[in-house]
């Protein structure tokens, strides 16, 4: 089982220094600051799931040098910043979504010896991201359906 920690209070002070190794901001309808870094030098697991996030501001994650797991499940991401994708040792947990194509491509081109990238569908089942992108995000499909969620075709 993956480790877990209790959800923080909804009133998050982004100027505060967080000392914990795990931070849970799940389901708080947060808006991440674009010009400010989260101050959490010990955090190895950051849960941002279910916040309605459309993007992950790269500055917000800039100082999280120890971060290993970033959970952004249940967020309608439209893009993943290249600088974040290039962090080869970061385990990104995200919904199967065509917006992950850039993340997949950057990892493929910059990170050697990686375990297969995974994504999660609406039933919380894991899928190989490469396979999902190939089936659900082919050029014709992607332009027709945008970067929303897609069901995995079997």
């Amino acid at each position: 089982l993956e480790p877990s920690c209790t959800v923080s209070s909804a009133d998050v002070d982004w100027n505060a220094e967080f000392s914990a190794t795990c931070l849970n901001f799940s389901g708080l309808s947060l808006s991440l600051p674009h010009n400010q870094s989260l101050r959490a030098s010990n955090v190895i697991l950051l849960d941002l799931s279910g916040n309605g996030l459309r993007e992950l501001p790269v500055t917000f994650f800039a100082h999280l040098q120890k971060l290993e797991v970033l959970n952004v499940l249940r967020n309608p991401l439209s893009r993943v910043d290249g600088a974040l994708a290039a962090r080869c040792d970061l385990d990104l947990q995200a919904d199967c979504n065509c917006a992950l194509e850039s993340w997949h491509d950057i990892r493929r081109d910059n990170c050697s010896g990686q375990k297969p990238l995974l994504c999660w569908d609406t039933t919380s089942s894991q899928h190989n991201l490469s396979a999902f992108l190939e089936v659900s995000c082919a050029p014709g499909l992607a332009s027709a359906t945008g970067s929303g969620h897609h069901h995995h075709h079997h």
């Epitope: 480790p3 209790t6 030098s41 190895i44 697991l45 120890k66 290993e68």
Partner: antibody, heavy 125, light 107 residues
């Protein structure tokens, strides 16, 4: 096979500096997420975490001892060091080094998976 | 600092009995708790991490449970080789802290 082995002076005089070495094999301290901690145990007592050094040379210390502790590493020779200044009899203990691994198949955990056998240090004049 | 309180300090059990060891954190530590077994004159060995994950090679008679502040290590059927000190430790916040240990003895 991952192994760690502590070495130290055995006996050190009060007010002197204690220098400990942890020699390890089977992993690299340049691997992302990897780290080594020093933990001690006084006779018949519980475990006390002292300091941790990360793969990127970042360090964490127990605040109760921070002013007296220095942790460092030599990645190329697979060694981690701990210095404790101004020792007194309360520093008499068995000193362990232990590895915090990076688990790439279920990350986000923090635990010590392998410990050294320990080195006994007596502070006495 | 997070204080980890282990109970009981010691317990005498017979082979085959079910053993329950408790560990209470002074504040919420999620599931960032590990259990270590330490036999006489040996170093600690990892049994359980993440409160409930059995470490590789650890017999399945050892089970960890709990979250937040209350944690339990259970030995379903005690064996003679289980006589040892058992330590819980939290890694949710620095400084990392351990309980004082529970000594498991033979009745």
């Amino acid at each position: 096979q991952v192994t760690l082995k502590e070495s130290g002076p055995g006996t050190v005089q009060p007010s002197q500096t204690l220098s400990l070495t942890c020699s390890f094999s089977g992993f690299s301290l340049s691997t992302s997420g990897m780290g080594v901690s020093w933990i001690r145990q006084s006779s018949g007592k519980g475990l006390e975490w002292l300091a941790h050094i990360y793969w990127d040379d970042d360090k964490r210390y127990n605040p109760s001892l921070k002013s007296r502790l220095t942790i460092s590493k030599d990645t190329s020779s697979n060694q981690v060091f701990l210095r404790i200044t101004s020792v007194d009899t309360a520093d008499t203990a068995t000193y362990y080094c232990a590895r915090r691994p990076r688990d790439f198949y279920g990350g986000g955990h923090w635990y010590f998976d392998v410990w050294g056998a320990g080195t006994t240090v007596t502070v006495s004049s | 600092d997070v204080v980890m309180t282990q109970t009981p300090k010691s317990m005498s059990m017979s082979v085959g009995e079910r053993v329950t060891l408790n560990c209470k954190a002074s504040e919420n530590v999620g599931t960032y708790v590990s259990w270590y077994q330490q036999k006489p004159e040996q170093s600690p060995k990892l049994l359980i991490y993440g409160a409930s994950n059995r470490y590789t090679g650890v017999p399945d008679r050892f089970t960890g449970s709990g979250s937040a502040t209350d944690f339990t290590l259970t030995i379903s059927s005690m064996q003679a080789e289980d006589l040892a000190d058992y330590h819980c430790g939290q890694s949710y916040n620095f400084p990392l802290t351990f309980g004082a240990g529970t000594k498991l003895e033979l009745k």
